[in-house]
Structure formats: C-alpha cells, structure tokens
C-alpha cells in the first residue's frame, strides 16, 4: 500500500437546509481507472463511515440510492455533498481515497473537514 496526499477544506458551514458541500482532491501518482471515495465522520474519538462510492474511468461517481451523499468527479477531484444534516451531526468529516486499479494500490486520507451544522430557528407563530 502506497501513501497519497489528499486535500480538503478545514471548515465548512452547512446550509440552513442541512446541506454541506466540499471538494476532496487527491494527488494521483498515475492515471487511475478505478477510484473509491469514502467519507468518514470522526466525533468523540469514534470514527464511522458516512458513505462510499467507486467510480470508473468515464463514469460518474455513484453512491447507493439511499445514501445521504452525492458527488461528481472531475479529474483528480471529487465534489462531495452531504444532505440531511442536523446540529448533532456536527463533526470532522474525513475524505479517504483509494486508487483501486491499476496496481499498485494507493491510499490517501485527508485531514478532515469540520462541518458545523446549526439547526434553523423555528418560525415564530404569527397572528394576523
């Protein structure tokens, strides 16, 4: 397994609708034809997998239908969007990239993007 540099933004603020987007860029040492991208969440020293997708040369990045993640790929970068976030989902979201094919296998893990999620204030009842 060979190491690879992965860059991602340090901080991202989710929108009021609970959507956060960030770019995950990897320094590919060669022309990979098969890439796997995994988003991990680290909170309270616990690491959990949020979503994962594999894409092949010529294809779009595809997550499972029930995934909270969507994404697009362009060259050596992946534009990731995580939806349905709430305040309790605030945490460090780490981008992990694996160059699956051709050999040799490369693995890169970013430093993480701190995503802050603020639940919207409920609208006050209004009397007319």
């Amino acid at each position: 397994c060979k190491a690879m540099h992965v860059a991602q933004p340090a901080v991202v603020l989710a929108s009021s609708r609970g959507i956060a987007s960030f770019v995950c860029e990897y320094a590919s040492p060669g022309k990979a034809t098969e890439v796997r991208v995994t988003v991990l969440r680290q909170a309270d020293s616990q690491v959990t997998e949020v979503c994962a997708a594999t894409y092949m040369m010529g294809n779009e990045l595809t997550f499972l239908d029930d995934s909270i993640c969507t994404g697009t790929s362009s060259g050596n970068q992946v534009n990731l969007t995580i939806q349905g976030l709430r305040a309790m989902d605030t945490g460090l979201y780490i981008c992990k990239v694996e160059l699956m094919y051709p050999p040799p296998y490369y693995l890169g893990i970013g430093n993480g993007t701190q995503i802050y999620v603020i639940d919207p204030e409920p609208c006050p009842d209004s009397d007319f």
Partner: antibody, heavy 116, light 110 residues
C-alpha cells in the same frame, strides 16, 4: 433490470448513412459511459466507440474515425451512433454496451448490412 | 489482425480444466485491466471476468482469470457442455485511446 435495446439497423448502399439508437432502462443512464461494439458475420468483436457519462470525452476506433459520430441524450436515456460514408466492411451486428472498459451489460444487437 | 492475441480454438472433455491465453503489450494488458467475455452461439457477449481476476455475481467460480506482465489467461475448471462458446479477452489501450479485443477462442467440449 438493466436493459439495452438497439434499433436503426438495416440495408444501406455503400456511401450511405444510418443512425443507430440504443434505448437504456433499469439504471441511471446519465451516470455511465456507453460504448458501441460490432461483430462482422462469423468474425470476432471489434470496439467502435465510447462516450463518457456527460459526453465530455469521445473515442473512436481508427477504422471509423471521421465517419462515425457517437452521441447521447441523457434526458431520453438514449445512445446514438451516426454512421456516414458506409463501406461494405462496416457490415456487422452493432451492440451497445455499458461502461468504458468493462462491458457489464450488452444489448441484443442490430444488424447493419452495407451492400449495393 | 487483432491487437490482443488469442489461440483460435481450444478443446477439452467434460470435467477437464482448460486455459485460454491472451497476449498483448505494455500499452494495453501491461497497464490496464483485462476483461473476459463469453459469447454463446447466437447471443450477445456476456461479462465473465473483470479487472484481471474478478467474477461478476452469477458467474460460477469454475471460471478464473489471471494476469502476468503483458499476458492474461482464462481458466475453466470442471468443464461442462454448456461452456461451449467463443471467449474474448479485452483491454483498454492507452496508446490507441481505445478498447481492444482479442480475436476470440472457440471452445469445444468434446
């Protein structure tokens, strides 16, 4: 269930044109590269062309370059192959297949016959 | 003349193990994934092996693929009469910026 259905084949004279279509269903068409592969009667498989999921990249076999054009309409889930200046050696069953270099699903093919 | 070279024919008896070879170059097999396809008489090709040695779901483990350098091979163990078909290897070719197939191998089960 993934399905690919080719149409548009038939008999055409040398120098003529034909447009093949491939209707896709059972998967998110706009996420996948699509290819055309042909097989002359009694012969082996020959790759013809590929188009990336968003149409950004197109590649062709040397034997069809400048004569054939691959395109797609993601809103209609359809792949196309415009064939111009047809020659007798283009006679073959034309298959559409999913992906760039790992053809995991194939249509049943449409026969193109170039003859006078 | 195909870019990838396969023997035109192969044969074996039921239960036997047969191997089909596929030879290429550094611009295709040497640096790109090898895929194998099975084409039964009168039908469209079917994906058999991808990324050199992986089987899609539904393909029996009697079929296996391997690669070494610029050559690849498909092995079929416990040969059955229904394995009688044409087998093609394929790979992306970086120099041609296109996909290349072998000429195909006709497998006969005696």
């Amino acid at each position: 269930e993934v399905q690919l259905l080719e149409s548009g084949g038939g008999l055409v004279q040398p120098g003529g044109s034909l447009r093949l279509s491939c209707a896709a269903s059972g998967f998110t068409f706009s996420n996948y590269a699509m290819s055309w592969v042909r097989q002359a009667p009694g012969k082996g498989l020959e790759w013809v062309s590929v188009i990336y999921y968003d149409g950004s990249n197109k590649y062709y076999a040397d034997s069809v370059k400048g004569r054939f054009t691959i395109s797609r309409d993601n809103s209609k889930n359809t792949l196309y192959l415009q064939m111009n200046s047809l020659r007798a050696e283009d006679t073959a069953v034309y298959y559409c297949a999913r992906n760039t270099y790992r053809f995991d699903y194939w249509g049943q093919g449409t026969l193109v016959t170039v003859s006078s | 003349q195909s870019v990838l070279t396969q023997p035109p024919s192969a044969s074996g008896t039921p239960g036997q193990r047969v191997t089909i070879s596929c030879s290429g170059s550094s611009s295709n097999i040497g640096n790109n994934a090898v895929t194998w396809y099975q084409q039964l008489p009168g039908t469209a090709p079917k994906l058999l092996i991808y990324s050199d040695s992986n089987r899609p779901s539904g393909v029996p483990d009697r079929f296996s693929g391997s690669k070494s350098g610029t050559s690849a091979s498909l092995a079929i163990s416990g040969l059955r009469s229904e394995d009688e078909a044409d087998y093609y290897c394929g790979s992306w070719d970086s120099s041609l910026s296109g996909y290349v197939f072998g000429g195909g191998t006709k497998l006969t089960v005696l």
